[in-house]
Amino acid sequence: AFGISGVQKYTRALHDSSITGISPITEYLASLSTYNDQSITFALEDESYEIYVEDLKKDEKKDKVLLSYYESQHPSNESGDGVDGKMLMVTLSPTKDFWLHANNKEHSVELHKCEKPLPDQAFFVLHNMHSNCVSFECKTDPGVFIGVKDNHLALIKVDSSENLCTENILFKLSET
């Protein structure tokens, strides 16, 4: 699994790079699964999409997402994993030209086709949690995380730091 050690590896990479803002520090392909090991599958067509959160069949290939890692341009007092008070942020893309977006009004996670530079809604602060898990906090709405609700991805408000370990906002990243 790509958890604590992986996040630390890319956090360390910040020291070796002066790149900030619109250029990613590094990119990484990984399958995304929930804390309970349900797979996340992205079913995109030109005019529609669906994101499945479910137990994947044994013989089926896991979808992968391209995670692009960025260093936040602005120092932060938030709890995001980073270096020198800066946060590590990611964008998540399941296929070329499409990215996960936070729709804070609808509390939903959406897929949008867009060109770079990506809007702020496509950026998530990466948190390195326990048990080799990570969580994704909306850049546009601190305290709101990508989570699982009714077998779908949704935006979930986390009231206190104690709730940061709630299972429905924890995800696993794996190379396989």
């Epitope: 992205f42 995109l44 030109d46 290939k61 030209d97 499409f98």
Partner: antibody, heavy 126, light 106 residues
Amino acid sequence: EVQLLESGGGLVQPGGSLRLSCAASGFTFSSYAMSWVRQAPGKGLEWVSGIADDFTSTYYADPVKGRFTISRDNSKNTLYLQMNSLRAEDTAVYYCARDLWMMNYAGGLRYPFGYWGQGTTVTVSS
Amino acid sequence: SYVLTQPPSVSVSPGQTASITCSGERMGDKYAAWYQQKPGQSPVLVIYRDTKRPSGIPERFSGSNSGNTATLTISGTQAIDEADYYCGVLKQDTGVFGGGTKVTVL
């Protein structure tokens, strides 16, 4: 509206060659894996070959390996099937089919064949 | 190579339920799809991912898959449902189809 239009079929002698084309429209062609599926007269469907995003991601059924070559030209929204060393048992209607979903970074073909062309007939006979 | 086995034919009276089976080793570990093909026409996807219907496919078509068998069920069968039906799976980036089942509406 998704449209797939095959062409290039015809009568060819055993050992001969044919090149089939499939012109695609109504969707972002480069985003989808594509396949060729054939159907011999009075028989069932048989998957022939598939292609994902580039020339390295090609897949073939055992009966056509080494004889058929699948390719695509994303600038022309066209899928191809080059068929060499044709045999009588290759006689069939050849359908071009698009994967239901866009390709994912995991690579390979994706789920079922969501859209089909009308087919082009290939007859191998002396 | 992976083999999917279907009954050659199934007969059903109008309004009744037709069930078509598709058997393969550990079929339930794969996602099954079903295609309808009417004479002289191209195949049409009617079920994918075991149970899901593409837009435009009537609700009377449903699917299930467990163990070694996937099943396509047509509830309240109509005359227009008379066709050949093929199951299919994707196995290691290779397409596999069953031999097809001719559904006759009596």
